[in-house]
């Protein structure tokens, strides 16, 4: 059978509701294997922008092979979750799950796919399709990790030092300089998961007269750039 | 190993009925989707329906529908084929084929049924 | 039904050199991100054998000179380079839900 490939592309688009849309099902070269009793559990790790609608897939196997599907949900500080359908009855069975926004796609026996619909950060976790047939189970589970954009500011607050913030972002952003200073770097941690990082740089050499800002984030990166004036200037403000 | 094994050849007069027989061995008979093909002398490969050994359930190409039925014998492991009113178009090589699950491909086929409808 | 159209219909090549396949579906085989389009061979008194699955995956004991592309509705088989065993009749088979396969493509060697 061919062997497991890594490789994951990410599809995104636009729904006619203007939201966008994620969906990691594919990777047409997945994970597939001698036929045993025991069928690999697939996992992957996936980030997804909040406030985006997500698609979640099952293996490729045709509902004519199945018994039972089911999506296992377990979010963080919740009690499990589970969406099951039976096709022998056409039956579809919840248990402690709800969070409206996650649905089936559709009619399960058209269509086994989960949606998420407008990613929120509690919707961090652990997403699993488990499907049944009459030789064993096949898995594919999903560690859904939701991504907020942190919004940026920079600022000279003393003379010749600068301030630079990513503000509520997930995960915590990364703070670089152009040129290097005499940096300190905190970071707070929200009780929502987000973390605002703020980086403070102090420049002694007197011909450096502009700073930039570089900030690295999973969704995305943004530079800011100051003059350095002998008196606090223009505060700058932005989203990545 | 995985094998499918297949009836002999048959020789049919026109509107009489044929019934193929695929003993399958080397895996669990009703863990497995079986598929039916058919492909007449120098022409291309056509489904004609699956039988689910695991629940009995079966589905039919529209056109074979009353015409054909497929069903099992869980205690010899096979499936079989029955192809009715028949006639020289039905003239072909009957093939029957196991679906794997991931996918849904076939990895598996029997060796092949010849049936001659002739008057 | 979604119908299966391969081209050319047959197809003559020398040995080292590049064939190429085509499957058109009449409409899309894929879905939940797979496309359910698999190659067979077939060679003279032979059952089909199985060459590619989901689109691109190679199965398990096919040379790695056959490859397999293509999402949506637009396939391609490609054997590269052929040798003068891959003188068979090729077809493409969507297997969703009800299956069809293709008319088929006879490859001979030159």
């Known amino acids: 059978a061919a062997q497991p490939n890594n490789s994951l592309m990410l599809q995104t688009s636009k729904e006619n509701h203007a939201l966008a849309s994620s969906s990691l099902c594919m990777d047409e070269k997945q994970i597939t294997q001698n036929y045993s009793k025991v069928l690999a559990e697939v996992n992957t790790s996936w980030p997804v922008k909040m406030a985006t609608n997500a698609v979640l897939c099952c293996p490729p196997i045709a509902l004519r092979n199945l018994i039972i599907i089911t999506w296992e949900i377990i979010l963080r500080g919740q009690p499990s979750c589970t969406k099951a359908y039976k096709k022998e009855t056409n039956e579809t069975k919840e248990t402690n799950c709800t969070d409206e926004r996650i649905t089936w796609v559709s009619r399960p026996d058209q269509n086994s796919d989960l949606q998420i619909r407008t990613v929120a950060i509690t919707h961090d976790g652990y997403y699993r399709c488990i499907m049944v047939t009459p030789d064993g189970n096949f898995h594919r589970g999903y560690h859904l990790q939701v991504l907020v954009t942190p919004e940026v500011t920079l600022f000279q607050n003393r003379n010749r030092t600068a301030v630079c913030k990513a503000v509520a972002g997930k995960p915590a952003a990364h703070i670089s300089w152009i040129p290097e200073g005499d940096c300190a770097t905190k970071q707070e941690y929200w009780s929502n998961g987000t973390v605002t990082v703020k980086s403070t740089c102090h420049w002694e050499v007197h011909n450096v007269s502009t700073v930039t800002c570089h900030v690295s984030h999973l969704t995305g990166n943004k530079s800011l750039y100051i003059e350095l004036l002998p008196v606090p200037g223009a505060k700058k403000s932005a989203k990545l | 190993q995985v094998q499918l094994v297949q009836s002999g050849a048959e020789v049919k007069k026109p509107g009489a009925s044929v019934k193929v027989s695929c003993k399958a061995s080397?895996?669990?008979?009703?863990?497995?989707?079986m598929h039916w093909v058919r492909q007449a002398p120098g022409q291309g490969l056509e489904w004609m329906g699956y039988?689910?050994?695991?629940?009995?359930?079966?589905n039919y190409n529209e056109k074979f529908k009353g015409r054909v039925t497929m069903t099992r014998d869980t205690s010899t492991s096979t499936v079989y084929m029955e192809l009715s009113s028949l006639r020289s178009e039905d003239t072909a090589v009957y093939y029957c084929?196991?679906?794997?699950?991931?996918?849904?491909?076939?990895?598996?086929w029997g060796q092949g049924t010849l049936v001659t409808v002739s008057s | 039904d979604i119908v299966l159209t391969q081209s050319p219909a047959s197809l003559a090549v020398s040995p080292g050199q590049r064939a190429t396949i085509t499957c058109r579906a009449s409409k899309s085989v894929s879905t939940s991100g797979y496309s359910y389009m698999h190659w067979y061979q077939q060679k003279p008194g032979q059952p089909p054998k199985l060459l590619i699955y989901l689109a691109s995956n190679l199965e398990s004991g096919v040379p790695a000179r056959f490859s397999g592309s293509g999402s949506g509705t637009d396939f391609t088989l490609t054997i590269n380079p052929v040798e003068a065993n891959d003188t068979a009749n090729y077809y493409c088979q969507h297997s969703r839900e009800l299956l069809t396969f293709g008319q088929g493509t006879k490859v001979e060697i030159k």
């Open positions: 080397g895996y669990t008979f009703t863990s497995y989707v």
């Open positions: 039988i689910n050994p695991y629940n009995d359930d079966t």
């Open positions: 084929a196991r679906e794997d699950y991931y996918g849904s491909r076939w990895g598996y």
